[in-house]
Interface confidence: low
C-alpha cells in the first residue's frame, strides 16, 4: 500500500486509522467502522466510507438531496453492510429487520420489505450522470475548456481513466457529467465510477476525504467554477424493481 | 491552437509498409482517442482504427485488423500508423483525428491536413 | 457493422435554397450521429454531432435531426460557399462508419 511512510497517514481516506505494523514495518491503513485494510494509493470504496462516516460523530452527517428523476439516493446515510472487497452487499437491512436491494453504489433499487427478502446479485450501476448549477459567472464558460477541466479533474484527482467520463454537457449554468463503465469494461485496478463520483460529491460539498489536501479548487481557464447545487442520477444495468406505489 | 499534424506519405511499394505519424499540439492528448482515417482518390471516408494515449489501447476496423498496428509515444504527443502488406487499394490520402471517450464523442472534431500515399512499383 | 446510405448522392440548388440530406443507418444508432463537410483539396470539417448538436463556429444556417435510422441534416438558406461533398458518421458502436457522400453543387 502506498500511505505515507513518514508519517503514517492515508493520502486518499482520511476516514483511516493508521500505523507503521504492516509488513517490515510498513504503514498500514484500516478504515473506520470496519476495521478494513484499505489501499491508499487509490480510491476506498464507498461502502467503506459510509460505514466510517457512520462511525463517526453525528453532527458530521448530511442528507442526500433527494430527486424524483431515475434512480437517486432518496434514503440518505444509513450504515451498510461490506462484503470482504468493501462492495456493498446486495442485500441491506437496518437495527428493526428492515430490509433492501440496492446497487453496487449502495442506493436502493426495490421496495423495502423484511427478512425473507431476497436479492440475488449486486447489480452494477454503469452510468452515472452528476447535475450540477454553478453559480453565476460574468460569462458562460468555454464548453471545450470546462470539459477538458472536468476530465482532468476525474483523471488526475480520483484517477479515474478518462474513457469512463463518457461526456460533458453545458448549458449555463447547468454542467452534467457522464460517467459510464459497464461490467466487462472495468479492468483489475480501474476506481469504480461509482467510488469516483462519491469523492466528487464530497468534494463538492466541501468535505473531502483526502489526507491534509486542500478542498476543491476547481477553475475553468482561471474562472472560479462554483457549485450551488448537486444532484445525481444512478443507472442500473438491470433496471429496479419498486412496486407502482412508489412511481406515483 | 489545437493542431493535428501527419508525416511520413509518399510512394510505397506493393507488399511492402506504410508508416505515418500525427504530431498533436495545443491540446491535452489523454484526454481524447487518436484515430486514423482514410481516403482512397475520389472515394469516401473509411476508419482504420484508434489508440487510447493514456494505455495504449486500440481498437480497429475489422478490414484491416491483421495488418494494421496504431503506436503511440505519449512523450512526444504523437501517434504513428503502420499498415503492412500494402497494395494499390490503399493508395489514399490518410488523416488522423481525434475524438473524445465515451461513445456520446466518437465524432472527430479536429482533423490533420492529411498525408498522401501511392502504392506502386 | 452499421452501414449508412446517404441521399441523394448528388444534388444541385440554387443560392438561397433549402436543402435536405438524408442519412439512413442500417440498425439503431440512437442520436449518435455526426455530419462533416469536405470542400475540394481540404480536410473534413464536423458540423454536427449527436445528431442535432451544432458544432463550436458552425453557422446556424446548418442544423441536424433525427434518432434512431433515420437522420438529415439540413441548410436553410444555401450559400455559395456551401459546395463541398457532405459525409454522416455514426459514433454509436465500432468500428465507426460513414456515408458514401453527398456531392452538393450550386446551379
Known amino acids: 500500500h502506498t500511505a505515507a511512510q513518514d508519517n503514517c497517514t492515508c493520502p486518499t481516506n482520511k476516514m483511516t486509522v493508521c500505523s507503521p505494523d504492516g509488513p517490515g514495518g510498513r504503514c498500514q491503513c484500516r478504515a473506520l467502522g470496519s476495521g478494513m485494510a484499505v489501499d491508499c494509493s487509490t480510491l476506498t470504496s464507498k461502502c467503506l466510507l459510509l460505514k466510517a462516516r457512520m462511525s463517526a460523530p453525528k453532527n458530521a452527517r448530511t442528507l442526500v438531496r433527494p430527486s424524483e428523476h431515475a434512480l437517486v439516493d432518496n434514503d440518505g446515510l444509513y450504515d451498510p453492510d461490506c462484503d470482504p472487497e468493501g462492495r456493498f452487499k446486495a442485500r441491506q437491512c437496518n437495527q428493526t429487520s428492515v430490509c433492501w436491494c440496492v446497487n453496487s453504489v449502495g442506493v436502493r433499487r426495490t421496495d423495502k420489505g423484511d427478512l425473507s427478502l431476497r436479492c440475488d446479485e449486486l447489480v452494477r450501476t454503469h452510468h452515472i450522470l452528476i447535475d450540477l448549477r454553478h453559480r453565476p459567472t460574468a460569462g458562460a464558460f468555454n464548453h471545450s475548456d470546462l470539459d477538458a477541466e472536468l476530465r482532468r479533474l476525474f483523471r488526475e484527482r480520483y484517477r479515474l481513466h478518462p474513457k469512463f467520463v463518457a461526456a460533458v454537457h453545458y448549458e449555463q449554468p447547468t454542467i452534467q457529467i457522464e460517467l459510464r463503465q459497464n461490467t466487462s469494461q472495468k479492468a483489475a485496478g480501474d476506481v469504480d465510477i461509482g467510488d469516483a463520483a462519491y469523492y466528487f460529491e464530497r468534494d463538492i460539498k466541501g468535505e473531502s476525504l483526502f489526507q491534509g489536501r486542500g478542498g476543491l479548487d476547481l477553475r475553468v481557464r482561471g474562472e472560479p467554477l462554483q457549485v450551488e447545487r448537486t444532484l445525481i442520477y444512478y443507472l442500473d444495468e438491470i433496471p429496479p424493481k419498486f412496486s407502482m406505489k412508489r412511481l406515483t | 491552437e489545437v493542431q493535428l499534424l501527419e508525416s511520413g506519405g509518399g510512394l510505397v511499394q506493393p507488399g511492402g509498409s506504410l508508416r505515418l505519424s500525427c504530431a498533436a499540439s495545443g491540446f491535452t492528448f489523454s484526454n481524447y482517442w487518436m484515430n486514423w482515417v482514410r481516403q482512397a482518390p475520389g472515394k469516401g471516408l473509411e476508419w482504420i482504427g484508434r489508440i487510447d494515449p493514456n494505455d495504449s489501447e486500440t481498437h480497429y476496423n475489422q478490414k484491416f485488423k491483421d495488418r494494421v498496428t496504431i503506436s503511440v509515444d505519449k512523450s512526444k504527443n504523437q501517434f504513428s500508423l503502420k499498415l503492412s502488406s500494402v497494395t494499390a487499394a490503399d493508395t489514399a490520402v490518410y488523416y488522423c483525428?481525434?475524438?473524445?471517450?465515451?461513445?456520446?464523442?466518437?465524432?472527430?472534431?479536429?482533423w490533420g491536413q492529411g498525408t498522401t500515399v501511392t502504392v506502386s512499383s | 457493422e452499421t452501414t449508412l446510405t446517404q441521399s441523394p448522392a448528388f444534388m444541385s440548388a440554387t443560392p438561397g435554397d433549402k436543402v435536405n440530406i438524408s442519412c439512413k443507418a442500417s440498425q439503431d444508432v440512437s442520436t449518435a450521429v455526426a455530419w462533416y463537410l469536405q470542400k475540394p483539396g481540404q480536410s473534413p470539417q464536423l458540423l454536427i454531432y449527436s445528431a442535432s448538436y451544432r458544432y463550436t463556429g458552425v453557422p446556424d444556417r446548418f442544423s441536424g435531426s433525427g434518432s434512431g435510422t433515420d437522420f438529415t441534416l439540413t441548410i436553410s438558406s444555401l450559400q455559395a460557399e456551401d459546395v463541398a461533398v457532405y459525409y454522416c458518421q455514426q459514433h454509436y458502436s465500432t468500428p465507426l462508419t460513414f456515408g458514401q457522400g453527398t456531392r452538393l453543387e450550386i446551379k
Open positions: 483525428a481525434r475524438s473524445g471517450f465515451g461513445s456520446t464523442y466518437w465524432f472527430f472534431d479536429v
